[in-house]
């Protein structure tokens, strides 16, 4: 048989979960067990991704959409569909090669993946240090030391002065 | 239908080699593809496997990590490139094209990779 | 999945039938075959456990299910002396038997 695309094509009659058999005269047949075609007209079903070792099912595979998989517990997924899984640490810490390691003074990290930021320098704003930073959390940033006049809350700064086609935040 | 293998050759332990597949008389972009090696006087082994738009690729387990297997549908092409070559890579390779059931339905002639010192 | 295949080596005369077997460690959907002959390219022969592949000669046949397939040849003839590979596909991807060689006498 000649395996390349007529004007007519009757693959193109194929209904997802099934794919063009070209050794049976193009008939339409299922897509096998653990494979699935999420479009018609396909020549070949694909692989069911299968969730195994630190990847779990999220959603099964069927014979017309792909499974879905995420991080077991302990992990977290990374890329586009959760290609891979990270190993969470704790807050206050980043993961490095050699596992996870707590950040160091000056930097911090408020979530169990990722890696440990600078703290805010509050001086390039012209502000002062209003909460000491942690390995968990960033400094707060306080109005500047000419602001806080006698009788001048130190824990709320002025509210800035509303813009034209600026929604309060 | 035909598959034409390239680019084998003779590797020392530790190096890299490009093996490619050139396809032609079938619409390549519709089909996933197959490495699958033969070892002098041995049986055949499957290696790598890519879907026909690369979104599903699978290894075996003697090359994950040091093979990568890849396409360009626009040239009608199949690629394996091996990495930190080893004695027991040393075969026959052929490409296949990938038939519905998961089966092998066309073969190339293959190409040959020796790993020695 | 692990496939065993028996025997490594037939032996048959003109005329005779013959069959070789496949065991997967686990069940598998189909099995296929291939054909394959000294310093050539293995040829599709049978595939989805039954089907015969494009110019394969009717005295072939494939069957079974689950864990146990086979090949026979109702009648040899000396152009089948080749080595015949099983090959799985399920959940694992591919795994192929270890082949049997079948001579003719």
């Known amino acids: 048989f000649e395996r390349t695309r007529s004007l007519q094509d009757p693959c193109s009659n194929c209904p997802a979960g099934t794919f063009c058999d070209n050794n049976r005269n193009q008939i339409c047949s299922p897509c096998p067990p653990n494979s699935f075609s999420s479009a018609g007209g396909q020549r070949t079903c694909d692989i069911c991704r299968q969730c195994k070792g630190v990847f779990r099912t999220r959603k099964e595979c069927s014979s017309t959409s792909n499974a879905e998989c995420d991080c077991t517990p302990g992990f977290h997924c990374l890329g586009a569909g959760c290609s891979m899984c990270e190993q969470d640490c704790k807050q206050g810490q980043e993961l490095t090669k050699k596992g996870c390691k707590d950040c160091c003074f000056g930097t911090f990290n408020d979530q169990k993946r990722g890696i440990c930021r600078p703290w805010t320098n509050c001086s390039l704003d012209g502000k002062s240090v209003l909460v000491n930073g942690t390995k968990e959390r960033d400094v707060v940033c306080g109005p500047s030391p000419a602001d806080l006049s006698p009788g001048a809350s130190s824990v709320t700064p002025p509210a800035p002065a509303r813009e034209p086609g600026h929604s309060p935040q | 239908v035909q598959l034409q293998e390239s680019g084998g050759g003779l590797v020392k332990p530790g190096g890299s080699l490009k093996l490619s597949c050139a396809a032609s008389g079938f619409t390549f972009s519709d089909y996933g593809m197959h490495w699958v090696r033969q070892a002098p006087e041995k049986g055949l082994e499957w290696v790598a496997y890519?879907?026909?738009?690369?979104?599903?690729?699978y290894y075996a387990d003697t090359v994950t990590g040091r093979f990568t297997i890849s396409r360009d549908n626009a040239k009608n092409t199949l690629f394996l490139q091996m990495t930190s070559l080893r004695s027991e890579d040393t075969a026959m390779y052929y490409c296949a094209s990938n038939n519905g059931y998961f089966y092998f339905d066309y073969w190339g002639q293959g190409t040959t990779l020796t790993v020695s010192s | 999945i692990v496939i065993t295949q028996s025997p490594a080596i037939l032996s048959a005369s003109p005329g005779e039938k013959v069959t070789m077997t496949c065991r997967a460690s686990s069940s598998v959907s189909y099995m296929h075959w291939y054909q394959q002959k000294p310093g050539s390219s293995p040829k599709p022969w049978i595939y989805a456990t039954s089907n015969l592949a494009s110019g394969v000669p009717a005295r072939f046949s494939g069957s079974g299910s689950g864990t146990s397939y086979s090949l026979t040849v109702s009648r040899v003839e000396a152009e089948d002396a080749a080595t015949y590979y099983c090959?799985?596909?399920?959940?694992?991807?591919?795994?192929f038997g270890s082949g049997t060689k079948l001579e003719i006498k």
């Open positions: 890519i879907s026909s738009g690369s979104n599903s690729i």
């Open positions: 090959q799985q596909w399920s959940s694992d991807p591919f795994t």
